[in-house]
């Protein structure tokens, strides 16, 4: 029997530094290319290896990006929000939203990300 | 399975016309900025040009107004019309895609990791 996936969202920010490739990574979404149904928000596409993103480590390929430099990311056209990244300076400050899958099965049973057993 | 698989090389005159096409399956086309490279023997491989996923193109300078690259979603294609060929155009031109734009540079950048690439198609301007 297989239990109930569900999801455990949360918010973090995170600073970066542009390094000498820049932030070191992709993002899809925009009001014209909606990633997600129903979201028209910006998410994290891909970690760059070696790049600054990856350095840091706090960010994960699947976050949406809710502000960047206290800039909401909301209704953006995504080449409007590359842009945006583009331009944001060296240091660059990220408010974003990891969405954690969590299993709850029955008792006794073990999700599929738990390193026990 | 991720495949991308172009066609449309071959032998055309200085001044000729081709259209590479780049098929891919496996994955979702419409997030990926799909490029296209050239390598001619002996020479580094070069970034020829791209486009983003939302249909944002870019070139490199020695091709601009020769070369117009397109995608066609519906068909998981994109296209490089290469026209007015020159000799310097000789090359083995393979296709390559990355998820999602970067927020760095454009496809065309150096920096620029794809995630996925053709086996190629030679192109000779003879």
């Known amino acids: 029997m297989n239990g109930r996936v569900d999801y455990l969202v949360t918010e973090e920010e995170i600073n970066l530094t542009r390094g000498p490739s820049g932030l070191g990574f992709n993002i899809v979404g925009g009001t014209d290319q909606q990633y997600v149904s129903n979201d028209s928000g910006i998410y994290v596409s891909r970690i760059k290896e070696n790049g600054a993103a990856a350095l840091d480590g706090r960010l994960q390929e699947g976050d949406k990006i809710l502000s960047v430099n206290g800039q909401d990311l909301k209704n953006l056209l995504h080449q409007d929000a590359v842009d945006l990244f583009r331009n944001a300076g060296y240091a660059v400050s990220l408010r974003v939203q990891h969405r954690l899958q969590v299993q709850n099965g029955p008792i006794g049973h073990r999700g599929e990300g738990d390193p026990s057993g | 399975d991720v495949q991308l698989v172009e066609s449309g090389g071959g032998l055309v005159q200085p001044g000729g016309s081709l259209r590479l096409s780049c098929v891919s399956s496996?994955?979702?086309?419409?997030?990926?900025?799909i490029g296209w490279f050239r390598q001619a023997p002996g020479k580094e491989r070069e970034g020829v040009s791209c486009?983003?996923?939302?249909?944002?193109?870019y070139y490199i300078d020695s091709v601009k107004g020769r070369f117009t690259i397109s995608r066609d979603n519906a068909k998981n294609t994109v296209y490089l019309q290469m026209n007015s060929l020159k000799p310097e155009d000789t090359a083995v031109y393979y296709c390559?895609?990355?998820?999602?734009?970067?927020?760095?540079?454009?496809?065309?950048?150096?920096?620029?990791?794809?995630?996925?690439w053709g086996q190629g198609t030679q192109v000779t301007v003879s």
């Open positions: 390559a895609a990355d998820f999602g734009s970067s927020v760095d540079s454009t496809c065309l950048s150096k920096e620029q990791r794809f995630d996925y």
């Open positions: 496996g994955f979702i086309f419409d997030y990926y900025a």
């Open positions: 486009i983003s996923s939302v249909g944002r193109a």
